[in-house]
């Protein structure tokens, strides 16, 4: 599960919903410590998304997500682009003008989904960019 | 110049610095309106970064940066990945557990830089991923 922390790098909704079905996901804004950009656990249930009536299989999948700080200095683990490195330096100088780079997927994998199309035909389709393989500062 | 707005999707420093040299950059957190993810103006001066003694040319470059909200629904302009679409839906359901996707470059361009290396040799090098061409939700 994702480590619990407060992450001010993201928008937080004031709405608190029941999270019993999200057992694989840590509460991303409950601790004061800000972690560096990294990959976090996230299991997505197609039932939770309301897609259970048209997706046959799988029931869900390990999607993961990216979150964390992209602060100076950006080390090698951050998979930072040259632009992100420059933006980090500009943010250091002008923090109210330019935001820090954000933590986003750098590599994504596909998954195969078996589903009913609009004509109730069973289709096996590969959906690209569904699973986070790695995260970085962009 | 970048439009002025408050963007809660980013960490903001309380440090206020002189921004006279950053004429191409709007203050990204001064207005209440939250804009959608898009490309913003940013001219980076190598002098401001303290690189003027080793970079011969150019003096600086139009780097641009990405900023803004990645909120439901993600439209076509958002260049969202499948993972970002899924993450947006999960965030709608569990806003305190999973952050929204973040606004990051989807395409980057290179620039050529003429500089002195550590041995004082003049090098012309193409630096990849220096200029934002387009932004999207990731």
């Amino acid at each position: 599960a994702a480590n619990k922390r407060k992450n001010q790098n993201r928008n937080k909704s004031s709405s608190h919903q029941d999270s019993s079905r999200m057992s694989s996901v840590g509460d991303y804004n409950t601790s004061e410590q800000k972690q560096a950009c990294k990959k976090h656990e996230l299991y997505v249930s197609f039932r939770d998304l309301g897609w259970q009536d048209w997706i046959i299989a799988p029931e869900g999948y390990a999607a993961f997500y990216c979150d964390g700080e992209c602060s100076f200095p950006l080390n090698a683990h951050m998979n930072a682009t040259n632009h992100a490195i420059v933006q980090t330096l500009v943010h250091l100088m002008f923090p109210d003008h330019v935001p820090k780079p954000c933590c986003a997927p750098t590599k994504l994998n596909a998954i195969s989904v078996l589903y009913f199309d609009d004509s109730s035909n069973v289709i096996l389709k590969k959906y690209r960019n569904m699973v986070v393989r790695s995260c970085g500062c962009h | 110049a970048a439009n002025k707005r408050k963007n809660q999707n980013r960490n903001k420093s309380s440090s206020h610095q002189d921004s006279s040299r950053m004429s191409s950059v709007g203050d990204y957190n001064t207005s209440e309106q939250k804009q959608a993810c898009k490309k913003h103006e940013l001219y980076v001066s190598f002098r401001d970064l303290g690189w003027q003694d080793w970079i011969i040319a150019p003096e600086g470059y139009a780097a641009f940066y990405c900023d803004g909200e990645c909120s439901f629904p993600l439209n076509a302009h958002m260049n969202a990945t499948n993972h970002a679409i899924v993450q947006t839906l999960v965030h709608l359901m569990f806003p305190d557990h999973v952050p929204k996707p973040c606004c990051a470059p989807t395409k980057l361009n290179a620039i050529s830089v003429l500089y002195f290396d550590d041995s004082s040799n003049v090098i012309l090098k193409k630096y990849r991923n220096m200029v934002v061409r387009s932004c999207g939700c990731h």
Epitope: - | A57, P58, E59, L114, S120
Partner: antibody, heavy 121, light 108 residues
Framework: QVQLQESGPGLVKPSETLSLTCTVS????????WSWIRQPPGKGLEWIGY???????RYNPPLKSRVTISVDTSKNQFSLKLSSVTAADTAVYYC???????????????WGQGTLVTVSS | EIVLTQSPGTLSLSPGERATLSCRAS???????LAWYQQKPGQAPRLLIY???SRATGIPDRFSGSGSGTDFTLTISRLEPEDFAVYYC?????????FGGGTKVEIK
């Protein structure tokens, strides 16, 4: 068309500071590197250093401890100061422009006509 | 620093003849960052060639430059009376920027 004109005293006493100014006309001093080169009588050329209009400098190492090049963009001028001069610093001093882009760098064009500075008591 | 050695020191030729001037670098000059200048007595040097082989604006096509690495050549295909002068090479591929000692082309 851009023109460069050196000015300053033609005679400097040993141990004193040589001061020269180069006035640029026909073009803005902005966006270029501006250089000083010298030529002792009957000898070859020696690069002294350059300044970018924004103020960054680079000097020839043997002269670095004695040289200061500065720029005044409002007057479209740049200047050379060479301290603790000796007779070996007697030379014709030239100012010149260096192009400054990734495709145009490092050669001197145009040059000022030069000014002879003699170091003697 | 890169030391540039020019040869010969003096070249005695007649108008109409071909002049070949050599400039040899103590180490490789990156990206052919080499220029040639002409200097007449009492005058400032004038840029002839940059980038080892590109003619500067207004320079007659009888002047040509060639070479790369450590060996560079300035060729004057047919000497005109106004070409008799001192010629300097200069490298700008490394700091400090350096000049060769010069080659004097004199009338034979």
């Amino acid at each position: 068309q851009v023109q460069l004109q050196e000015s300053g005293p033609g005679l400097v006493k040993p141990s004193e500071t040589l001061s020269l100014t180069c006035t640029v006309s026909g073009d803005s001093i902005s966006s270029y590197y501006w250089s000083w080169i010298r030529q002792p009588p009957g000898k070859g050329l020696e690069w002294i250093g350059y300044i970018y209009y924004s103020g960054s400098t680079r000097y020839n190492p043997p002269l670095k401890s004695r040289v200061t090049i500065s720029v005044d963009t409002s007057k479209n001028q740049f200047s050379l100061k060479l301290s603790s001069v000796t007779a070996a610093d007697t030379a014709v001093y030239y100012c010149a422009r260096i192009c400054s882009s990734t495709s145009c760098w490092g050669w001197f064009d145009p040059w000022g006509q030069g000014t002879l500075v003699t170091v003697s008591s | 620093e890169i030391v540039l050695t020019q040869s010969p020191g003096t070249l005695s030729l007649s108008p109409g003849e071909r002049a070949t001037l050599s400039c040899r670098a103590s180490q490789s000059v990156s990206s052919s960052y080499l220029a040639w200048y002409q200097q007449k007595p009492g005058q400032a040097p004038r840029l002839l060639i940059y980038g080892a082989s590109s003619r500067a604006t207004g320079i007659p096509d009888r002047f040509s430059g060639s070479g790369s690495g450590t060996d560079f050549t300035l060729t004057i295909s047919r000497l005109e009376p106004e070409d008799f002068a001192v010629y300097y090479c200069q490298q700008y591929g490394s700091s400090p920027l350096t000049f060769g000692g010069g080659t004097k082309v004199e009338i034979k």
